[in-house]
C-alpha cells in the first residue's frame, strides 16, 4: 500500500523530521507549512489549523521559505555614489553597488555599504593595477623611457616617442619633443621589455620590466595635461 500522505499540520514520527518547506512548531508540536518568499506568517499553526501566510508590505521582503512574523525591511535608498542594481521587491532586498569610477571600500552581505572614488594617477605615474569592484587603483611611477601627462584612473605609462633628433628629452611626466622630422612610437606587439628610447634622460632606475605599461598596447599621440576638477579628490 502507498504510504499515507500527511497534510499539515501533522505530528511527526518519533525522532522524525518535517518535510521540505515545513517547520516544527514547538508550541503546537506539529509539522506546519512555511510561507513562500514574499510572504510571512500572519497566524502560526495550531494542532488543528495550518500556518496562515500574508504578503509582505511595501518596502519589506522575505527571500526564503519562512515562518517569520514580520517581513524584513529593505535597505535604505542607494546613496549618490551608488547605483541600484536590484530593486526592493516583496521577494528580494535592494542591492546597491558603486557607480563607474568608484569602488567598494566597505562591503556588506549583499552590495556595498561605502563607496570610494577610484584613485587618479597624477602626471609621472601610471595605472599599475586597475581598480576593481572592491579594490582601488594602484599608481606607480613611469619607468625610464615612458611617461604619463594625464590625471587618470585608467591611463598607463606610454613610451616616449623615438626621435631622429630630440628637441626636448622626455621625462616621466612629459613626452620627448622631436625636431621637425616625423617621430615613431615603437612598441612591438607582445614585447616584454620596453624599448630604450633614443636620447631620453633616464628618470630612475628600474630593475624589472615597467609595471605600468601593458605590452602590445596600441599607443596614441600624447594629449595635453588634464588635471581634475577643482576640489575633486583622488581617494
Amino acid at each position: 500500500l502507498p504510504a499515507q500522505v500527511a497534510f499539515t499540520p501533522y505530528a511527526p514520527e518519533p525522532g522524525g523530521t518535517c518535510r521540505l518547506r515545513e517547520y516544527y512548531d514547538q508550541t503546537a508540536q506539529m509539522c506546519c507549512s512555511k510561507c513562500p518568499p514574499g510572504q510571512h506568517a500572519k497566524v502560526f499553526c495550531t494542532k488543528t489549523s495550518d500556518t496562515v501566510c500574508d504578503s509582505c508590505e511595501d518596502s519589506t521582503y522575505t527571500q526564503l521559505w519562512n515562518w517569520v512574523p514580520e517581513c524584513l525591511s529593505c535597505g535604505s535608498r542607494c546613496s549618490s555614489d551608488q547605483v541600484e542594481t536590484q530593486a526592493c521587491t516583496r521577494e528580494q532586498n535592494r542591492i546597491c553597488t558603486c557607480r563607474p569610477g568608484w569602488y567598494c571600500a566597505l562591503s556588506k552581505q549583499e552590495g556595498c555599504r561605502l563607496c570610494a572614488q577610484l584613485r587618479k594617477c597624477r602626471p609621472g605615474f601610471g595605472v599599475a593595477r586597475p581598480g576593481t569592484e572592491t579594490s582601488d587603483v594602484v599608481c606607480k611611477p613611469c619607468a625610464p623611457g615612458t611617461f604619463s601627462n594625464t590625471t587618470s584612473s585608467t591611463d598607463i605609462c606610454r613610451p616616449h616617442q623615438i626621435c631622429h633628433v630630440v628637441a626636448i628629452p622626455g621625462n616621466a611626466s612629459m613626452d620627448a619633443v622631436c625636431t621637425s622630422t616625423s617621430p615613431t612610437r615603437s612598441m612591438a606587439p607582445g614585447a616584454v621589455h620596453l624599448p630604450q628610447p633614443v636620447s631620453t634622460r633616464s628618470q630612475h632606475t628600474q630593475p624589472t620590466p615597467a609595471p605600468s605599461t601593458a605590452p602590445g598596447t596600441s599607443f596614441l599621440l600624447p594629449v595635453g595635461p588634464s588635471p581634475p576638477a577643482e576640489g575633486s579628490t583622488g581617494d
Partner: antibody, heavy 119, light 106 residues
Framework: EVQLQQSGPEVGRPGSSVKISCKAS????????MHWVKQSPGQGLEWIGW????????DYAEKFKKKATLTADTSSNTAYIQLSSLTSEDTATYFC????????????WGQGVMVTVSS | DIQMTQSPPSLSASLGDKVTITCQAS??????IAWYQQKPGKAPRLLIR???TLESGTPSRFSGSGSGRDYSFSISNVESEDIASYYC????????FGAGTKLEIK
C-alpha cells in the same frame, strides 16, 4: 591605522656610513612608493628620493645621487636609506613619507631620525 | 628641475589676523601643490593638497588657491596653535619644497 615607525638616532664617524629604517604598517606596503626627506638643524625640507618597494626602482634628487641609497624589504614592510661617506653636512633629521601617486604625496610621515656626524 | 620660491621667510601676526604665504614655481605645475605645517621636533603634517583640497582634520580657517605658476596659502583667523613653519611642495615633476615660512605671534 597607518604608521611609519623609524629607527633610533644614529651617530656616525666622518667617512663612514649609516643605514636607517622605516617600518610601515596599516596599509599594503607595495601599493605606495616611499620618499625620504632631509631636514638640517634649523633649516627647511629637502627631498632626497623615492623607492618603489614592489619593484625596487628608485629616483633621486640630483644632489643626493652619490650620497643616498634607497632600498626596501617587502618581507618586513621596511624601507631603508643608507648614507655613505658621511660629513658634517649630513647631520640632519631624516624622514620617510609615503605617496600614493595621486593627489596626496606625503600623507603619512615617520617621526624622523636624527643622524649626527661627529669624530 | 622645478624650483619653488616661497615668501615671506618669516611672518609675525596677531591672534585673529589673516596671513598669506605665496609660492611661485619656475614653470606651470598644473595645481599640483601641497601645503604642510611643521611644529618644532615633529614631522610635517599635510594640510592642503592639489592647491585647495583640505585634508581631513584640517581646520576650515586654512585655505589654498592658485593656478599655473602662482599659488597662495592663507590662515584666515590665526590661533596660537598655528605657530609653526609652513612649506609648499610641488609634485608634478619629481618633488620640490619651498624654503619655508616661520609664523610667529606678536
Amino acid at each position: 591605522e597607518v604608521q611609519l615607525q623609524q629607527s633610533g638616532p644614529e651617530v656616525g664617524r666622518p667617512g663612514s656610513s649609516v643605514k636607517i629604517s622605516c617600518k610601515a604598517s596599516g596599509y599594503t606596503f607595495t601599493d605606495y612608493i616611499m620618499h625620504w626627506v632631509k631636514q638640517s638643524p634649523g633649516q627647511g625640507l629637502e627631498w632626497i628620493g623615492w623607492v618603489d618597494p614592489e619593484y625596487g626602482s628608485t629616483d633621486y634628487a640630483e644632489k643626493f645621487k652619490k650620497k643616498a641609497t634607497l632600498t626596501a624589504d617587502t618581507s618586513s614592510n621596511t624601507a631603508y636609506i643608507q648614507l655613505s661617506s658621511l660629513t658634517s653636512e649630513d647631520t640632519a633629521t631624516y624622514f620617510c613619507a609615503r605617496d600614493d601617486g595621486s593627489y596626496s604625496p606625503f600623507d603619512y610621515w615617520g617621526q624622523g631620525v636624527m643622524v649626527t656626524v661627529s669624530s | 628641475d622645478i624650483q619653488m620660491t616661497q615668501s615671506p621667510p618669516s611672518l609675525s601676526a596677531s591672534l585673529g589676523d589673516k596671513v598669506t604665504i605665496t609660492c611661485q614655481a619656475s614653470q606651470n605645475i598644473n595645481k599640483y601643490i601641497a601645503w604642510y605645517q611643521q611644529k618644532p621636533g615633529k614631522a610635517p603634517r599635510l594640510l592642503i593638497r592639489y592647491t585647495s583640497t583640505l585634508e581631513s582634520g584640517t581646520p576650515s580657517r586654512f585655505s589654498g588657491s592658485g593656478s599655473g605658476r602662482d599659488y597662495s596659502f592663507s590662515i584666515s583667523n590665526v590661533e596660537s596653535e598655528d605657530i609653526a613653519s609652513y612649506y609648499c611642495l610641488q609634485y608634478v615633476n619629481l618633488l620640490t619644497f619651498g624654503a619655508g615660512t616661520k609664523l610667529e605671534i606678536k
